[in-house]
């Protein structure tokens, strides 16, 4: 039994780091392998992660962590029974993948304006709470070419757009993801998408309506 692709890990900078690797053949990850991890810190102890299968030869392990600070460094040991397959280290602050934003809501009751809001995935005491920026993806279910990205570079988890920038009378979906420039993170996964029917009065119709009075 050998490791084909060495473990690579990312941290959510809160409570979980996820490590993935590939073996040289089909493996029952949960029964055959153990990933031991230990914070490099005085009087810390080794903890065991039981991996799950991620494809035939792939394994994934979710390492529980109390919290994360930039100084943290972990040793990682991948064991198959008594055989040490791989030894490495992982510094969570250098491999951050933020949690996905949640609770994406589209408010359509504001006159001719769409207000999209979502929740910051971190509690206020987490360092990333005040350092996330977002990308909002809006697309039409009817027209694959109608696909747009809005970059939200301010901290507030919301986006206002004119309803008229989208086509009227059709359904749209939106999703949002996050990243933090301070740690040069990767993008988070996309949030679950939310759907709404875009309808608004065309400017011409409004003008015509005005002249009838």
């Amino acid at each position: 039994m050998k490791v084909l692709q060495e473990p690579t890990c990312v941290s959510d900078y809160m409570s979980i780091s996820t490590c993935e690797w590939k073996m040289n053949g089909p493996t029952n990850c949960s029964t055959e392998l153990r990933l031991l991890y230990q914070l490099v810190f005085l009087l810390s102890e080794a903890h065991t992660c039981i991996p799950e299968n991620n494809g035939g030869a792939g394994c994934v392990c979710h390492l529980l962590m109390d919290d994360v600070v930039s100084a943290d460094n972990y040793t990682l040991d991948l064991w198959a029974g008594q055989q040490l397959l791989w030894k490495g280290s992982f510094k969570p602050s250098e491999h951050v993948k933020p949690r996905a934003p949640g609770n994406l809501t589209v408010h359509t009751n504001v006159s001719d304006t769409l207000l999209l809001t979502w929740s910051n995935p971190y509690p206020p005491d987490n360092y990333l709470y005040n350092h996330l920026t977002y990308a909002v993806n809006i697309w039409s279910e009817n027209d694959p070419a109608d696909f747009r990205i809005y970059n939200v570079t301010y901290l507030e988890p919301s986006l206002r757009i004119a309803a008229s920038t989208l086509k009227s009378g059709i359904s749209y979906r939106a999703r949002v993801r996050a990243w933090a420039q301070c740690y040069n993170t990767t993008w988070s996964e996309w949030s679950p998408s939310t759907k709404w029917h875009n309808s608004y009065r065309e400017p011409f119709e409004q003008h015509h309506h005005h002249h009838h009075h």
């Epitope: 005085l42 102890e45 529980l64 943290d72």
Partner: antibody
Framework: EVQLVESGGGLVQPGGSLRLSCAVS????????MSWVRQAPGKGLEWVSS????????YYADSVKGRFTISRDNSKNTVYLQMNSLRAEDTAVYYC??????????????????WGQGTTVTVSS | DIVMTQSPLSLPVTPGEPASISCRSS???????????LDWYLQKSGQSPQLLIY???NVAAGVPDRFSGSGSGTDFTLKISRVEAEDVGFYYC?????????FGQGTKLEIK
């Protein structure tokens, strides 16, 4: 009520051995690291050794490395200090102390918040 | 090893007056989580040491509120707002960020 009670001290000749014990009650022993600290007559405090709650992590002062062995029996709520090749400079009162919670991913530290009454080790010919 | 240096080594104080002991470490004893791994202990005559302050500023359970700790990085201070007769003894600072734990030489507080 937290209690730590050391025993096993005594008079021993240079080169001899002693085994100190520290019996603990009043807290979840296996969750906590334990430490030994000594104090030579008329001198200050000197850290000797520490062990994690599970026993997998062990640390020694350079002055005792290779001669002293720390261990613990979580089923007996006891931590031990096996002292071999004793020297005159090992003469001291030996204290055991409750250290940090070590079973968490990041050890939680609240100081050496409880100490035993100490046991005296005298190394002399 | 981290060297801990205390001053003064002897501190005569009048009851009711404040007292201050300084402790300096040869290396930073703060970890990335912002905690300073610096404690203060009092050893009264014929007794075991007792914890006063942990992680630089936290007052241990049962310790009178006249004791306080301050400082960060390499410079720390133990203050007693109003010294009482029962406060006499040796005061030690100790770093526990890395092994070996190291203590200061001790400060003897005595009543004038």
């Amino acid at each position: 009520e937290v209690q730590l009670v050391e025993s096993g001290g005594g008079l021993v000749q240079p080169g001899g051995s002693l085994r100190l014990s520290c019996a603990v009650s009043g807290f979840t022993f296996s969750s906590y690291a334990m430490s030994w600290v000594r104090q030579a007559p008329g001198k200050g405090l000197e850290w000797v050794s520490s062990i994690t709650g599970g026993g997998g992590g062990i640390y020694y002062a350079d002055s005792v490395k290779g001669r002293f062995t720390i261990s613990r029996d979580n089923s007996k709520n006891t931590v031990y200090l096996q002292m071999n090749s004793l020297r005159a400079e090992d003469t001291a009162v030996y204290y055991c102390a409750k250290d940090r919670i070590s079973i968490t991913i990041r050890p939680r530290y609240f100081g050496l918040d409880f100490w035993g009454q100490g046991t005296t080790v005298t190394v002399s010919s | 090893d981290i060297v801990m240096t205390q001053s003064p080594l002897s501190l005569p104080v009048t009851p009711g007056e404040p007292a201050s002991i300084s402790c300096r470490s040869s290396q930073n004893v703060v970890y990335g989580n912002g905690y300073n791994y610096l404690d203060w202990y009092l050893q009264k005559s014929g007794q075991s040491p007792q914890l006063l302050i942990y992680l630089g500023t936290n007052v241990a359970a049962g310790v009178p509120d006249r004791f306080s700790g301050s400082g960060s990085g390499t410079d720390f201070t133990l203050k007693i707002s109003r010294v009482e007769a029962e406060d006499v003894g040796f005061y030690y600072c100790m770093q526990s960020l890395q092994a070996p734990y190291t203590f200061g030489q001790g400060t003897k507080l005595e009543i004038k």
